[in-house]
């Protein structure tokens, strides 16, 4: 279930925008980055898609938001929330957050000025 996140811009607008896009390619891209091509992460068939392709698909999805710049933090928070339970330890959580904060730059978007990724009731 989606919980209410701290909003940077127009809250209802950002929520609708994040709801409308498919964040799976971003989740897959970041998992690929932190786990490489390890076979242990078999919940997604990530070996068949090159990392750069996955990154472009992720950027493509983020670009579908009406205002990606304004709602980027909400998108990053949702990705974090979606993947939180899959992150096995604290080190993996930190790696995931690091990669997540690099995502806007990888996609040539401006990074949000402030974005708190401590979502999911402290689990992550």
């Amino acid at each position: 279930m989606r919980r209410e996140r701290g909003r940077q811009g127009d809250s209802s607008s950002c929520e609708r925008q994040v709801d409308r896009v498919n964040l799976k390619p971003c989740e897959q891209h970041i998992m690929q980055r932190i786990m490489g091509e390890q076979e242990q992460y078999d919940s997604y068939d990530i070996r068949s898609t090159r990392s750069s392709d996955q990154q472009q698909r992720c950027c493509d999805e983020l670009n579908e938001m009406e205002n990606t710049q304004r709602c980027m933090c909400e998108a990053l928070q949702q990705i974090m929330e979606n993947q939180c339970d899959r992150l096995q330890d604290r080190q993996m959580v930190q790696q995931f957050k690091r990669e997540l904060m690099n995502l806007p730059q990888q996609c040539n978007f401006r990074a949000p000025q402030r974005c708190d990724l401590d979502v999911s009731g402290g689990r992550c």
Epitope: S13, Q56, R57, E61, N63, E64, E66, N67, T68
Partner: antibody, heavy 119, light 112 residues
Framework: EVQLVESGGGLVKPGGSLRLSCAAS????????MSWVRQAPGKGLEWVSY????????YYADSLKGRFTISRDNTENSVYLQMSSLRAEDTGVYYC????????????WGRGTLVTVSS | QSVLTQPPSVSGAPGQRVTISCTGS?????????VHWYQQFPGSAPHVLIY???QRPSGVPDRFSASKSGTSASLAITGLQADDEADYYC????????????FGGGTKLTVL
């Protein structure tokens, strides 16, 4: 120079087909989402179709669904609009335009190509 | 009929201030979507005049400004000049339409 150049317009009979091309230069097309916008003579702008950078999102104006098909070939730096079952009301200048990265507006436009549907 | 409503024409004398309105609904401007404005001279392609409700691209004079409130937006031009005579279009994003792109019908600005 960063530019878009449309081609493929011309005179076609009602019921006929036409394929418009949009050649991009000066920027990386594969990272850009693109749209076609048309303008009937003496009328306003009407959005026609949209294709995202990886082609995973394709949209059409409701009035055109089923008759027009947008596609792209990033290796050829081109975007296309295949138009079929053309009608007189499809007459106008067709513009190719680039969606800006991170926001929902068109920051680069071609000069347009004229499509005339007449018997 | 356009999803966004603009007056078909406005006019003003050189040096005057004119405004062009753009009225939408709760599924586009009223839903928080940004409004963008394009200028089009006869025989030319449109180009962005204002983006993100009130941002001017480099090269656009500060005589052009825009604002947004509720379900509508407006473009203001101060110190009107002869070469401002053109068509002006607003554009936004609509959550209820599959394509999302929506334009206003356009406003012809005549400098008297």
């Amino acid at each position: 120079e960063v530019q878009l150049v449309e081609s493929g317009g011309g005179l076609v009979k009602p019921g006929g087909s036409l394929r418009l091309s949009c050649a991009a230069s000066g920027f990386i097309l594969s990272r850009s989402s693109m749209s076609w916008v048309r303008q009937a003579p003496g009328k306003g702008l009407e959005w026609v179709s949209y294709i995202s950078s990886t082609s995973s999102h394709i949209y059409y104006a409701d009035s055109l669904k089923g008759r027009f098909t947008i596609s792209r070939d990033n290796t050829e730096n081109s975007v296309y609009l295949q138009m079929s079952s053309l009608r007189a009301e499809d007459t106008g200048v067709y513009y190719c335009a680039r969606k800006t990265n991170g926001a929902w507006f068109l920051d680069l436009w071609g000069r347009g190509t004229l499509v005339t549907v007449s018997s | 009929q356009s999803v966004l409503t603009q007056p078909p024409s406005v006019s003003g004398a050189p040096g005057q201030r004119v405004t062009i309105s753009c009225t939408g609904s709760s599924s586009n401007i009223g839903a928080g979507s940004d409004v963008h404005w394009y200028q089009q001279f006869p025989g030319s392609a449109p180009h962005v005049l204002i983006y993100g409700n009130n941002q001017r691209p480099s090269g656009v004079p500060d005589r052009f400004s825009a604002s947004k409130s509720g379900t509508s937006a407006s473009l203001a031009i101060t110190g009107l000049q002869a070469d401002d005579e053109a068509d002006y279009y607003c554009q936004s994003y609509d959550y209820d339409l599959s394509g999302s792109w929506v334009f206003g019908g356009g406003t012809k600005l005549t400098v008297l």
